[in-house]
């Protein structure tokens, strides 16, 4: 045998090459037939109708056919004869890659709730081989489950992922990535989840500022609630009592003037929307107020205390159950 | 003006040997391929052989397969066929034709 | 055996048009070429690549080729068009098949 042909892989409309090597020869007919075994060339001559067909190279060792703007159909068995006595024939086979022509993404629902399993799919169209589908949720690589539909060997791919979503999923691409010999780089789509959660209550005293709460002072506390959507209401209650008469609210701020002993309590921010509500306790202790000493009459003696307050604010903003937030004065 | 005259053509025994000559003119021989076609009396057309420019390589119907010979002589611008374990179902009028892209441009007058 | 399959006959009255078909498997692939054969003579070509025509042949023959058949048209035919013809392709992997031929008489 000294007829000689190479296997070739090409991607649906690009242009494949399909050589007829002759070793020892002086001259002689070679013949390439389609996989119909209608001939397409016959030494330099072209009696197939498609002008996808054309000559590279005709000589005594070579006959080199370039066929352009592949299709799918045109995959098969291509054989090269050589009318020697034997005659010898040998084949060629080409493949052709088809690329996913869609990628389309699909999820269940436009907006989910924090804790809600939700279901996305991603459908890889018509390729041929099956696109492999590869999910990520930002730059965490996910597991997902594909299923493969054959149609006239031409492979839909759809993968299905379950992704049960938290508040910080709220922003963050969920990507359906294809790898597939046809295609170079990177092809992906991608959606942005949207993901609601109850608000997460957050006091902050913004007076006094070194947070030691005495009788005749002032005390600002400012209430921040974030959520999704955005808290509708913010409100502030006293546990277990009534508002003093000389509080002021204004929207998350609650002001108390001239603070006396009969403040002291549990100030709850309560904040809600759609999805849940929540809050956040501040415990008032109010002090006396700082004594004065008089001066001495005879010696003159400075001292100094240092009173140390140690802020401790606990939070914990889960449905349904209390959180609190304490200052203690030590 | 393309010439195509074929000669050699006769009477002969089954089982006899001819051979055919075929004569061109008016164009440049050896850059075409050659063909043999045959047509039995009150017959249709039926290709024979077919040889390349060079001479190198040559085709034959199934139906002359061993038995008949193509070959070419460039410098005197001939073809040549060669028939051999002549039968009665081989006569007919042997036509040589000049090929151009796979079709018979010019044909010769023939010889029976 | 590869075949080409030609009507044995075709009548035609002068100037009217005379068709004569060719039918072979997957003939719309390939190109056809066309052979005219006046009694005593030999055969001329009046078209190849289904519908050329080479120098000399006059603008009344013309070709068509699709699907599984190749017709040659003769439109105003004349006395001298009365001839034998003979349709030629590549069939499947077989070279230079001809068709069993037409005679087209002229009334």
């Known amino acids: 045998q000294n007829l000689f042909t190479k296997d070739v892989t090409v991607i649906e409309g690009e242009v494949a090459t399909i050589s007829c090597q002759v070793n020892k020869s002086d001259d002689s007919v070679i013949q390439l037939l389609n996989p119909n075994r209608q001939t397409i060339y016959f030494r330099d001559f072209r009696p197939l109708k498609d002008s996808r067909f054309q000559l590279l190279n005709f000589s005594s060792s070579e006959l080199k056919v370039s066929l352009t703007n592949v299709s799918i159909s045109d995959e098969g068995r291509y054989f090269c004869q050589l009318y020697t006595d034997p005659p010898q024939e040998s084949y060629t086979t080409i493949t052709v890659l088809v690329p996913p022509r869609n990628l389309m993404i699909d999820i269940q629902k436009d907006t989910a709730v924090e804790g809600e399993e939700i279901e996305v799919n991603c459908t890889a169209m018509a390729s041929k081989p099956a696109t492999t589908i590869r999910w990520f949720k930002g730059n965490t690589e996910l597991k997902g489950k594909s299923e493969v539909e054959e149609w006239s060997d031409m492979y839909t791919v759809t993968s299905q992922l379950m992704l049960k979503v938290h508040k910080e999923d709220d922003g963050v691409p969920v990507i359906c990535q294809v790898e597939h010999p046809a295609v170079t780089g990177n092809l992906q789509t991608q959606r942005y989840l949207e993901v609601q959660y109850k608000p997460q209550v957050h006091i902050q005293m913004t007076y006094p500022l070194q947070g030691l709460t005495r009788e005749g002072d002032a005390l600002e506390l400012t209430c921040e609630a974030i959520g999704k959507p955005q808290p509708v209401m913010v409100t502030w209650v006293r546990v277990d009592d009534e508002m003093p008469q000389h509080a002021v609210l204004s929207g998350p701020n609650l002001f108390i003037n001239n603070l006396n002993k009969t403040d002291n309590g549990t100030y709850r921010c309560e904040a809600s929307n759609i999805v849940g509500k929540a809050h956040s306790d501040y415990m008032l202790y109010v002090y006396d107020p700082p004594t004065t000493i008089p001066p001495p009459t005879t010696t003159t003696t400075t001292t100094t205390t240092t009173t140390t307050t140690i802020l401790t604010i606990i939070t914990d903003s889960r449905a349904g159950e209390e959180g609190s937030i304490r200052a203690v004065d030590h | 003006e393309v010439q195509l005259l074929e000669s050699g053509g006769g009477l002969v025994q089954p089982g006899g040997s001819l051979r055919l000559s075929c004569a061109a003119s008016?164009?440049?021989?050896?850059?075409?391929?050659m063909v043999w076609v045959r047509q039995a009396p009150g017959k249709g057309l039926e290709w024979v052989s077919y040889i390349v420019p060079s001479g190198g390589a040559t085709l034959y119907a199934d139906s002359v397969k061993g038995r008949f010979t193509i070959s070419r002589d460039n410098s005197k611008n001939t073809l040549y066929l060669q028939m051999n374990s002549l039968r009665a179902e081989d006569t007919a009028v042997y036509y040589c034709?000049?090929?151009?892209?796979?079709?018979?441009?010019?044909w010769g007058q023939g010889t029976l | 055996q590869y075949e080409l399959t030609q009507p044995p006959s075709v009548s035609v009255s002068p100037g009217q048009t005379a068709r004569i078909t060719c039918s072979g498997d997957?003939?719309?692939?390939?190109?056809v070429s066309w052979y005219q054969q006046k009694p005593g003579q030999s055969p001329v070509l009046v078209i190849f690549e289904d519908n050329k025509r080479p120098s000399g042949i006059p603008e009344r023959f013309s070709g068509s080729n699709s699907g599984n058949t190749a017709t040659l048209t003769v439109s105003g035919t004349r006395a001298m068009d009365e001839a034998d013809y003979y349709c030629?392709?590549?069939?499947?992997?077989?070279?230079?098949?001809f068709g069993t031929g037409t005679k087209v008489t002229v009334l």
């Open positions: 997957r003939l719309g692939e390939t190109y």
């Open positions: 034709a000049r090929v151009k892209a796979g079709v018979f441009d010019y």
């Open positions: 008016g164009f440049t021989f050896s850059k075409y391929e």
């Open positions: 030629q392709a590549w069939v499947g992997s077989t070279p230079f098949v």
